[in-house]
């Protein structure tokens, strides 16, 4: 028997006729045991369908009466087998059994899909005792059914270590289609086919699927769920959803955006984080990725000097962390810097170019042709040199640093002199006689001290010795510097 909840279900007596021993249906129960509080009556369905033999579990009592007549087999009476109703409606169903009074402590439990229903369910057991038997009615009600209430319900009773099981009552809760798989947002290549999947279930079945693209239904004919939509390709972004319908109504999935992969937008906000004489640290804000992950970026550097040859240096780097240190640059130079990034589709345009400058650096070469000679009459050492090439000064020359080390009889003493940038000679006082003086010179800019020249040694004799010829650094390509006497 199938009963639709929204049809007119009329309540009727729990028992269509008296129980053995003249129990009438209008008797009030002597004992009512609610399994949970808050019971509310709901739709009531016929608990009995007399007339056919019971097929469920039966307990045959071994006890006999004084006349030794065997008691009839114990079994639950037949009840409604299948209840169909809409979501959020109420339902009530029951099991009933007549138990000889010789049995004590009989309890009925409710089970759903093989699991006992414990806790706050609206279950009530009522007992109607008579001379020989007690009629027991176990009622189960659900005030607002949900899909999760779908299933097979049975009653169980334990008696004499025997278990009596009722026929199942199948509850089918019908409602709008329920999505088990909805389409997902995707980023796709232009004019390339892709699939979208939609699946919804009832009950009631069947569930049919219509696909919607940009508010227009794609298919005139529905497809039975599950449905796979093959889109042959798109040239522009589209929004897809699916509509599932069954005999209860329509449910619409979330709308998903299908984006077309494109080349990225150029990076923005390229900025200078730090400058040194030979490197510039830049950062940038990536542009829109074109719906495809960035793979790498390219930093383009060109000299801003109008007299330069206009060649572009290219430095490739990973897309993260949007930071790159450009190296091997000249000091005190102006550069134009642009950034471009790529994804699987291609390279972005170059960002707006920015101007950046390297700072002054320490000179990269030492002064040339350093010569040293002793002026014994004034007890001085004269030093001469040539200033380094302008290009390699890496900044504006502010002077020179002279290191002179005096060594004699195990004693060593280094002194440093700073001289101005004008001129290319210096005079230092003899510090120790009968000693070797080692001289090195470095050019100095605001960027720092450059490398020292190769050492030039001169021997300072004791008083009264003859003058010596000057010592000098060799010309490029010559042998090591030597003391010239």
């Amino acid at each position: 028997a199938i009963t639709e909840a929204r049809e007119e279900a009329k309540p009727y007596p729990l028992f269509p006729g008296p129980f053995p021993g003249s129990l009438q249906t209008d008797h009030t129960p002597l004992l009512s045991l609610p399994h949970a509080s808050g019971y509310q009556p709901a739709l009531m369905f016929s608990p009995t369908q007399p007339g056919r033999p019971h097929t469920g579990n039966v307990a045959i009592p071994q006890v006999t009466s004084v006349e030794s007549k065997p008691l009839p087999p114990l079994a639950f009476k037949h009840t409604v087998g299948h209840i169909i109703l809409s979501e959020h409606k109420g339902v009530k169903f029951n099991c009933s059994i007549s138990v000889p009074n010789i049995y004590q402590d009989t309890t009925i439990s409710w089970w759903k899909d093989g699991k006992e229903l414990l806790g706050a369910h609206h279950a009530i057991t009522q007992f109607y005792p008579d001379d020989e038997v007690t009629a027991i009615i176990a009622s189960f009600s659900i005030t607002s059914v949900q899909r999760s209430d779908n299933g097979s319900y049975i009653c169980k009773m334990k008696i004499n270590n025997e278990e009596i099981v009722s026929d199942p009552i199948y509850i089918e809760v019908q409602g709008l289609p329920h999505f088990t798989k909805q389409p997902e947002s995707m980023n796709v290549t232009r004019n390339t086919a892709f699939n979208l999947t939609c699946q919804a279930v009832g009950p009631p079945e069947p569930v049919n699927i219509f696909w919607v693209q940009n508010s227009s239904r794609v298919n005139e004919q529905p497809e039975k769920s599950p449905s796979v939509l093959t889109v042959p390709g798109l040239t522009e972004m589209a929004v897809f959803s699916c509509e599932a319908h069954n005999d209860k109504g329509l449910t619409v999935s979330k709308g998903v955006q299908i984006n077309i992969k494109a080349i990225p937008s150029p990076p923005t906000e390229v900025s200078i984080r730090n400058s040194t004489a030979h490197s510039i640290l830049i950062s940038w804000v990536p542009g829109f990725d074109g719906y495809s992950p960035f793979r790498n970026c390219s930093i383009q550097v060109k000299e801003a000097d109008p007299l330069s040859n206009g060649s572009v240096m290219i430095f490739n780097t990973s897309a993260l962390p949007h930071l790159y240190q450009i190296k091997q640059l000249q000091a005190l130079a102006n550069y134009s810097i642009g950034v471009s990034c790529m994804n699987e589709i291609g390279w972005s345009a170059v960002s707006p170019w920015i101007l950046a400058s390297t700072t002054e650096g320490a000179p990269s070469v030492a002064p040339l042709n350093v010569t040293v000679f002793l002026n014994e009459s004034s007890d001085n050492v004269d030093i001469r040199w040539m200033k380094p090439p302008t290009k390699q000064q890496d900044g504006e020359l502010v002077g020179y640093r002279i290191s002179h080390v005096w060594q004699s009889a195990g004693i060593s003493k280094e002194l440093l002199e700073e001289v101005g940038q004008n001129g290319s000679r210096a005079r230092i006082s003899v510090q120790v006689h009968n000693a070797t003086c080692t001289v090195r010179i470095a050019a100095v800019t605001r960027g720092g001290v450059g490398p020292f020249s190769d050492p030039v040694k001169i021997f300072i004799p004791a008083h009264g010795w003859v003058d010596y010829a000057p010592s000098s650094t060799p010309a490029p390509g010559n042998a090591d510097p030597v003391l010239i006497i």
Epitope: P206, F210, K224, H245, D247, G249
Partner: antibody, heavy 114, light 109 residues
Framework: QVQLKESGPGLVAPSQSLSITCTVS????????ISWVRQPPGKGLEWLGV???????DYNSALKSRLTISKDTSKNQVFLKMNSLQTDDTARYYC????????WGTGTTVTVSS | QAVVTQESALTTSPGETVTLTCRSS?????????ANWVQEKPDHLFTGLIG???SRAPGIPARFSGSLIGDKAALTITGAQTEDEAIYFC?????????FGGGTKLTVL
């Protein structure tokens, strides 16, 4: 392409019954619910009832006692039967796809007259 | 039974945007009313335009769009054309039955 085509008697005597057939092509009735709609001359549309994919029905409550909708899925046909016709049942009768009223038959004119 | 109300007539010009509305006597129109819009042209030609979740039927031009505006269902024709002159019926679903509105006669002058 989904197409619906109604066929009916044209003229029905008062108090007699009306039977109309809607033949569906391009789709199976096991996946398409069909509604019946009528339009009296010079008036608006009135929904009569629906037959669901599973064979269940719902009717316009004002006409429920006189209406029966059924179908033969194997022949892809839906049937409308209406009893006790009166002159105000004169109308053009249409079958249409249900949840989206987007596929309509061309309709069949029924005149109730003696 | 619910009563569904539409404007009896509207006039627009080609290229203009016009909105037809559909009100329910039971309260605000919601998505569960599955508002449908049906166009009737001479010789009993009915075409469903919008249905379900405000989606256009296959082949219906994008100038037709359905929506819920306030407590009413609405059909908007963006850039009306002379061939859009017709009667437009709205239908609302109430749990187990459709109710049609009286129809709006749209004139495109």
């Amino acid at each position: 392409q989904v197409q619906l085509k109604e066929s009916g008697p044209g003229l029905v005597a008062p108090s007699q019954s009306l039977s109309i057939t809607c033949t569906v092509s391009g789709i199976s009735l096991s996946s398409f619910a069909i509604s019946w709609v009528r339009q009296p001359p010079g008036k608006g549309l009135e929904w009569l009832g629906v037959i669901w994919t599973g064979g269940g029905t719902d009717y316009n409550s004002a006409l429920k006692s006189r209406l029966t909708i059924s179908k033969d899925t194997s022949k892809n046909q839906v049937f409308l039967k209406m009893n006790s016709l009166q002159t105000d049942d004169t109308a053009r009768y249409y079958c249409a796809s249900h949840w989206y009223l987007d596929v309509w038959g061309t309709g069949t004119t029924v005149t109730v007259s003696s | 039974q619910a009563v569904v109300t539409q404007e009896s007539a509207l006039t627009t010009s080609p290229g203009e945007t016009v909105t037809l509305t559909c009100r329910s006597s039971t309260g605000a129109v919601s998505t569960s009313n599955y508002a449908n819009w049906v166009q009737e042209k001479p010789d009993h030609l009915f075409t469903g335009l919008i249905g379900g979740a405000n989606s256009r039927a296959p082949g219906i031009p994008a100038r037709f769009s359905g929506s819920l505006i306030g407590d009413k269902a609405a059909l908007t024709i963006t850039g009306a054309q002379t061939e859009d002159e017709a009667i437009y019926f709205c239908a609302l679903w109430f749990s187990n039955h459709w109710v049609f509105g009286g129809g709006t006669k749209l004139t495109v002058l």
